[in-house]
């Protein structure tokens, strides 16, 4: 048995658990999900037994092999998958373990503004980027675009300081997970520093 293989899939998508076997005479192959049998294959009789009806349309073995393709992925398909190859020529089954992480395609991140101070024409505040549905394993970066600077900032919180009379700055939050990325609406420093309460066009 080899090291644990990590796989990533997206909700609604498909993933293939690769299986390469050197075993000559295979009696049966059993795929398991979190200790629950998923599929049993008996190559001799060409029998494939899918344990749960709801998985019947989601399970496939492409190209006539034994690699398992799981379609129409759901969030709760995340977990540990295990395959055992049983053969009379082996003293104990040949095994392989997989960990599947299923991620949602990210929606547009939401930006909120912290307490704002506007002293002597300099506006100081924090912008916080977050996902409304609390998606997992999201990495946030900020892009600051404008004549004054083109730079990136890692993390969900962006501290900003913008002077009246300064070149306009546009801030965009980029949210990423292993399967997708999405962008917040662009936020103009000059509009932000006016205060969203006054600004019907506020991009937040």
């Amino acid at each position: 048995s080899g090291p644990v293989k990590e796989l990533v899939g997206s909700v609604g998508g498909a993933v293939t658990f690769p299986l390469k076997s050197k075993v000559k005479q295979v009696d049966s192959i059993v795929w398991t999900f979190n200790t629950t049998p998923l599929v049993t294959i008996q190559p001799e009789g060409g029998t494939i037994i899918v344990t749960q009806n709801r998985n019947r349309e989601r399970v496939d073995f492409p190209d006539g092999g034994y690699s398992l393709k799981l379609s129409k992925l759901k969030k709760n398909d995340s977990g540990i998958y295990y395959v055992g190859i049983y053969s009379s020529s082996l003293q104990q089954p040949s095994t392989q373990e997989y960990v599947l992480h299923v991620y949602e395609h990210l929606s547009k991140p939401k930006v909120t503004m912290g307490l704002q101070s506007n002293k002597n024409g300099t506006c100081v505040t924090n912008l916080t980027c977050c996902m409304e549905h609390g998606e997992e394993d999201v990495i946030y970066t900020w892009k600051a675009l404008g004549q004054a600077a083109n730079e990136s900032h890692n993390g969900s919180i962006l501290p900003i300081s913008w002077r009246w009379g300064e070149s306009d700055m546009t801030f965009i939050c980029v949210a990423r997970n292993p399967v997708s990325r999405n962008f917040s609406s662009p936020i103009l420093a000059r509009k932000l520093c006016e205060g969203a309460a006054d600004d019907p066009d506020s991009s937040m």
Epitope: G121, T122, Q147, R163, W164, G165, E166, D168, R190
Partner: antibody, heavy 118, light 107 residues
């Protein structure tokens, strides 16, 4: 083309009041800060007031604070400066000005003359 | 308030000459300074913003430099249309303050 046209300048007695207006066209008026800047007879430029795009924030130097009020009507694309308790040192050519996305005072009107004299 | 001291207050120069005008801030203003030109009978016009950035459409003979407290505007080869008054403006903080101006006249 950005156009700023000031009006309302006049000869006024010390202690009197006056309201200036600036009609704006050719740009998204409600999206930009607007300012008043004056030029004295000695040709000095003095910043007078600034109002933010939605009218929420206003800024003044000490020399006019409490006497002048800047306001705007975004529906009419018009900027105003209400001046009261006028003094001889307020005599100047009053310009309205706005910014572009890169810098302040990118566009200026032609000015309106305010003379405070007995 | 930040005081902007501009010098000289007036100067005479010949066509083709190199001209430098300076502006000194009473405290550190980083690069938060703009330069304006006002031709006779006209409204002021921005030449340079953020101390050294040339406004689109302004001839390349104009340049700005400096940061902190000391700034300068240079015209490499003076032309007739450059006559007028030049002002600096600090926008590091309110109140915004202008220099007193430099009147540039033809020698």
């Amino acid at each position: 083309e950005v156009k700023l046209v000031e009006s309302g300048g006049a000869l006024v007695k010390p202690g009197g009041s006056l309201k200036l207006a600036c009609a704006a066209s050719g740009f998204a008026f409600s999206s930009y800060d607007m300012s008043w800047v004056r030029q004295t007879p000695e040709k000095r430029l003095e910043w007078v007031a600034t109002i933010s795009s939605g009218g929420r924030n206003t800024y003044y130097p000490d020399s006019v604070r409490g006497r002048f009020t800047i306001s705007r009507d975004n529906a009419r694309n018009t900027l105003y400066l209400q001046m009261s308790s006028l003094r001889s040192e307020d005599t100047a050519l009053y310009y309205c000005a706005t910014r572009n996305s890169n810098y302040a005072f990118a566009y200026w009107g032609q000015g309106t003359l305010v003379t405070v004299s007995a | 308030d930040i005081k902007m001291t501009q010098s000289p207050s007036s100067m005479y120069a010949s066509l083709g000459e190199r001209v430098t005008i300076t502006c000194k801030a009473s405290q550190d203003i980083n690069i938060y300074l703009n330069w304006f030109q006002q031709r006779p009978g006209k409204s002021p016009k921005t030449l340079i913003y953020r101390a050294n950035r040339l406004v689109d459409g302004v001839p390349a003979r104009f340049s700005g430099s400096g940061s902190g407290q000391d700034f300068s505007l240079t015209i490499t080869s003076l032309e007739y249309e450059d006559m007028g008054i030049y002002y600096c403006l600090q926008f590091d903080e309110f109140p915004l303050t202008f220099g007193a101006g430099t009147k540039l006249e033809l020698k």
